[in-house]
């Protein structure tokens, strides 16, 4: 049995509430903390030893419609002289997140949860494979 953390309470549905089909819910697409301040990035995507670019992907049948994906700019990593060292590897850092997929069934519209793999940035790693001649 899960115990709520301090300051948390589990929602208890009153017994008088009508029953809802299992696995479905009512959804408010308004966002809590919508104006939360994002800390300054200070261009870390350019200053990193494994720099990356951002691309905005757009899908009108997904919520959120806009998802930002990162792409590693290099195969290797950038050394102190600004040169690419291919004996180190730039690799993507990925986060699996849930989005809502809009489904049209006749006149009704519903949403289904969908897993989405988001690349948030890149990092530099030592290679696991060393070529032996």
């Amino acid at each position: 049995q899960r115990v709520p953390k301090e300051g948390q309470t589990f929602f208890q549905k009153p017994e008088s509430c009508p029953s809802v089909p299992e696995g479905s819910l009512k959804l408010d697409l308004g966002i809590i903390n919508a104006n939360q301040r994002v800390p300054l990035s200070r261009n870390i995507e350019r200053r990193s030893t494994s720099p990356w670019n951002y691309t905005v992907t757009w899908d009108p049948n997904r919520y959120p419609s806009e998802v930002v994906q990162a792409q590693c700019r290099h195969l290797g990593c950038v050394n102190a002289q600004g040169k690419e060292d291919i004996f180190m590897n730039s690799v993507p850092i990925q986060q699996e997140t849930l989005v809502l997929r809009r489904k049209h069934q006749g006149c009704s519209v519903s949403f289904q949860l969908e897993k989405l793999l988001v690349t948030v940035g890149c990092t530099c790693v030592k290679p696991l494979i060393h070529h032996v001649h």
Epitope: Q69, Q71, H74, G76, S90, V91, Q94
Partner: nanobody, 123 residues
Amino acid sequence: DVQLVESGGGLVQPGGSLRLSCAASGRTFSSYVVGWFRQAPGKEREFIGAISGSGESIYYAVSEKGRFTISRDNSKNTLYLQMNSLRPEDTAVYYCTADQEFGYLRFGRSEYWGQGTLVTVSS
């Protein structure tokens, strides 16, 4: 998972050109390093080159630099190999490959491979 399908192979005369394509489907294409290998009859698989997720960084095997050009179009989930001044010794099955780490791909240890497309250079 990522599925890779090569196309564009065929018979070409010496000195001719050919452009191979590799269509990817599945997970985010732009998060993968992608590249090309080839395998001539009776020989080991040989690394041709690779390109970073954004397409800004390209690495070629020394032997192929100049004649072969690798590019990618992330909006089309496609990798390309432009081959010029083809010679009979370029006859091989050409494979497209993908991995999140260049070090794995470079030494033929990629997670994903296409089925290959045959290129024959002959008069």
